[in-house]
Amino acid sequence: DYKDDDDKGWVWEPLFVTEEETSTMPMYVGQLKSDLDKEDGSLQYILTGEGADSIFFINEHGKIYVRQKLDREKKSFYILRAQVINRKTRHPIEPDSEFIIKVRDINDHEPQFLDGPYVATVPEMSPEGTSVTQVTATDGDDPSYGNNARLLYSLIQGQPYFSVEPKTGVIRMTSQMDRETKDQYLVVIQAKDMVGQAGAFSATATVTINLSDVNDNKPIFKESLYRLTVSESAPTGTSIGTIMAYDNDIGENAEMDYSIEEDDSQTFDIITNHETQEGIVILKKKVDFEHQNHYGIRAKVKNHHVPEQLMKYHTEASTTFIKIQVEDVDEPPVFTLESYVMEIAEGVVSGSLVGTVSARDLDNDDSSVRYSIVQGLHLKRLFSINEHNGTIITTEPLDREKASWHNITVTATETRNPEKISEANVYIQVLDVNDHAPEFSKYYETFVCENAVPGQLIQNISAVDKDDSAENHRFYFSLAQATNSSHFTVKDNQDNTAGIFTAGSGFSRKEQFYFFLPILILDNGSPPLTSTNTLTVTVCDCDTEVNTLYCRYGAFLYSIGLSTE
């Protein structure tokens, strides 16, 4: 029995009502009693508070009864006040006392999973024991009394991959799982109250467990061997084909990079199309069918992102071999030189050999070519070519003094495919032959004064030659054997010029108005050529003043070396 806190004389036992009790009502709950109660009916007990009269009542002996069945989950206790009074005087015998009637729990609630549906994600290949998620069930029964709300969790579906901790509901992995084998699991968890004993209620929850991807797969080529072709006319940078690898991972983990592992020729490259995840084989250097028409390269593929801890899955990159066949493009014949320089002496007879051009069909060693000369409309045909062997000959003698160089264009045409033509320039130099004699470089007007003294210079002369003026080209001047040699002398200056001097004095216009000097000019060609050029010397009537010497004849006024009107 219990006494009130105030220790005033109230006596009661703990008061409980088992919920959902279905025995006949009213049902006895317990006894409230004052120790002053003589049990003679002189005292009256009064209940106030929660549920007084409506749910609970007390009789004259202090016995408390419940009128109806209770539900702990709606209300788990009731707080009431008890009074005891003298029935006659209505005076309290004891002070009021507060007491509690507890509703005792029965297992009338099933566990419930309130947070579903459950979805959890865990990285694939996570180690055994990795926590995936936690599920928690609730039970409306009293957790503080008995086992009605004490739950145990167990796995209904999901073995052997998952386990659940019985008390906490933590789901763990029991083995390493591969997303690429299966990426989603449905796990069914049961929560059972009464710690699993008989009469327990249970509930189940489905947990969808998704495996997230880790980079545990390397990319692998779809084919171990590829065959591509490229035209020899393809420019550098041309895409000649694609190669493809697959990766069982997804997203970033499947991003890959292609590269060349082996290409001795360094002719090709591989770039990655990150949108399609294909490798594009690119021509890095131009190919030439005639030089090499079969290539073999090895390509490799690797993932773009590989964390250090996953490198064990990526030890050896997948490779593939690519055979590349070069396709022939029929090319025009190729001359041995882009341009030819030939030479021939001027004046040689027609039909003389100038030189030979040569071209060949690189596409076919056995195929012949035909040669021809492109004829300009305005050009005289000075040369011809042998169409079979490319020898060029003259069609008439050439004159260097008319043209020292000739530029002709020759063509080579494939006999098996006349559309294929190539051209080359031929520059022909006409070599000089000493076929022109020297002559005065201009017409000289030469004067001598009547009062000239011996040894006086009256004229400087020079010569020209239509032949090629080489550095060591020389002209030699002398007086031809003639009657006037006593009046004048020629002095060769050794520099391709000469001076004409008076040899005597006493020139008289009356006696001889002109002298005609035959001057011999010799070159140093091979063989040397000579010519006689006549210098006309006019005798003048001169003033005595040195700087104003005049030569009067008829209506003309002459000055030595100059003429004025």
Epitope: E223, S224, L225, Y226, R227, T229, E262, D264, S265, E290, H291, Q292, N293, H294, Y295, G296, R298, F321, K323
Partner: antibody, heavy 120, light 107 residues
Amino acid sequence: QVQLQESGPGLVKPSQTLSLTCTVSGGSISSSGYYWSWIRQHPGKGLEWIGYIYYTGSAYYNPSLKSRVTISVDTSKNQFSLKLSSVTAADTAVYYCARDGSSGWYFQYWGQGTLVTVSS
Amino acid sequence: EIVLTQSPGTLSLSPGERATLSCRASRNISSSYLAWYQQKPGQAPRLLIYGPSSRATGIPDRFSGSGSGTDFTLTISRLEPEDFTVYYCQQYGSSFTFGPGTKVDIK
């Protein structure tokens, strides 16, 4: 293991056309990346490549024989064939069919060869 | 076309000796484009080496290849009785051509 077997007449008259067939077993002629060749060997002499074909029908021939050679393929029969026209005694040889390699254009698999004699 | 020259034409050696066979190209070829074959009388050629030092499947390791540019070598480290036969080199870069062969016979 890929195996190749040549078949065809052992005697051909001059100016006629030599025809040989190669049957492939142990693998498909349509395998990606492989080329199927004909090679010949004159008696007591070295080897001369004649030409090859890819299963798509694309062929390439030795330039010196190009004008006389035709190689064709029949994927349904897993066979490829050689035709050499206007034959002379100089075409007398052992004719081999071959398949190239998985890492290059070398000849990895060969038939045992068939002797073709050109004679009237 | 690329012409391959093999030397010597005939190589006379004894079993157990080392054989060195030479193959020379008329112009540079990439080392990846050369192969060696063995041919026994009445048989088809058999691939030994490609590229130029990779052994074909089932080829004993006494066979090895080397070289680059225009000069290539096949070496048989210790001649076995079955190795005395004819050997051909082949280039497969510019069309396909074979060397004339080297005969290895017993001294």
